[in-house]
């Protein structure tokens, strides 16, 4: 892969109510099925017109899911993650991982193992600084005048 | 995508006995979930019976329970869907359904993602 990607990892909480139509996504991953180098991780591979997901509109494919009802997803075989999914009744309580693209740069997803990923504070405090010091020489520069 | 073709559907009497045919292609087989779906006229489509990917397990919508087995032979990228003691209520256009990954039950439509076009039980 050409260059540089870089990401904002944000999580959230999602409870969805598996409706008539089903919760409407589907999953890849596993020990037995690694969707991303170095990561067994189950990802969402697939949102589905009207389930609950794409009703809900918070989960979006390529998320990562960390656990189910409380119930962790790490080094799970494939199917053993579909069956806690399916096992996990009408309200669902997702822990999700969202992966934001920050940087112009081939898309893709980030492995566990890759140091790409970087805490939005690492992005802020520079720009921050940077503001901080752009407006002191901007006072220097008038009180000249 | 799965390309899916149906057959064995035909006009049988009641308490006869047909065995549908679902032959697949186009990805591996032997991970899919398999299902079989009814549509019969002016009524809503029906989930009938499903067949899991990775484990085999199958399950079965009440009112054929007992009457209908599903099957899969991985080697011939087919799954089977043998009805015995059929009703005149069996009747309908029978849709065979595969996917992979859902996290839904397999008697949920939206679980998934390619669909025959179906064939035809007449019970009479």
């Known amino acids: 892969m050409n260059g540089r990607v870089d990401y904002l990892v944000t999580e959230e909480e999602i409870n969805l109510t598996r409706g008539p139509s089903g919760l409407g996504f589907n999953i890849v991953g596993g020990t037995d099925q690694q969707y991303v180098s170095n990561d067994s991780g189950i990802y969402v591979s697939r949102i589905k017109e009207n389930g609950a997901a794409a009703l809900d509109g918070r989960l979006q494919e390529g998320d990562k899911i960390l656990s189910v009802n409380g119930q962790d997803l790490k080094n799970l075989l494939h199917q053993d993650a579909v069956d806690l999914f399916r096992n996990a009744g009408y309200a669902v309580s997702l822990r999700v991982q969202h992966r934001l693209q920050v940087q112009n740069g081939p898309i893709g997803h980030r492995g566990e193992g890759d140091p790409s990923g970087i805490p939005i504070f690492m992005v802020l405090v520079p720009v921050f600084a940077l503001t901080m010091v752009a407006a002191w020489a901007f006072m220097r520069y008038r009180q000249q005048l | 995508d799965v390309q899916l073709v149906e057959s064995g559907g035909g006009l049988v009497q009641p308490g006869g006995s047909l065995r549908l045919s679902c032959a697949a292609s186009?990805?591996?087989?032997?991970?899919?979930?398999m299902g079989w779906f009814r549509r019969a006229p002016g009524k809503e489509r029906e989930f009938v019976a499903a067949?899991?990917?990775?484990?085999?397990?199958?399950d079965y919508s009440d009112s054929v329970k007992g009457r209908f087995t599903i099957s899969r032979d991985n080697a011939k990228n087919t799954v089977y869907l043998q009805m015995n003691r059929l009703k005149p209520e069996d009747a309908a256009v029978y849709y065979c359904?595969?996917?992979?990954?859902?996290?839904?039950?397999?008697?949920?439509?939206?679980?998934?993602?390619?669909w025959g076009q179906g064939t035809q039980v007449t019970v009479s």
């Open positions: 186009g990805r591996s087989f032997s991970s899919l979930d």
């Open positions: 359904a595969a996917g992979f990954g859902s996290v839904d039950g397999l008697e949920y439509p939206i679980s998934y993602d390619d």
């Open positions: 067949i899991s990917g990775s484990r085999g397990s199958t």
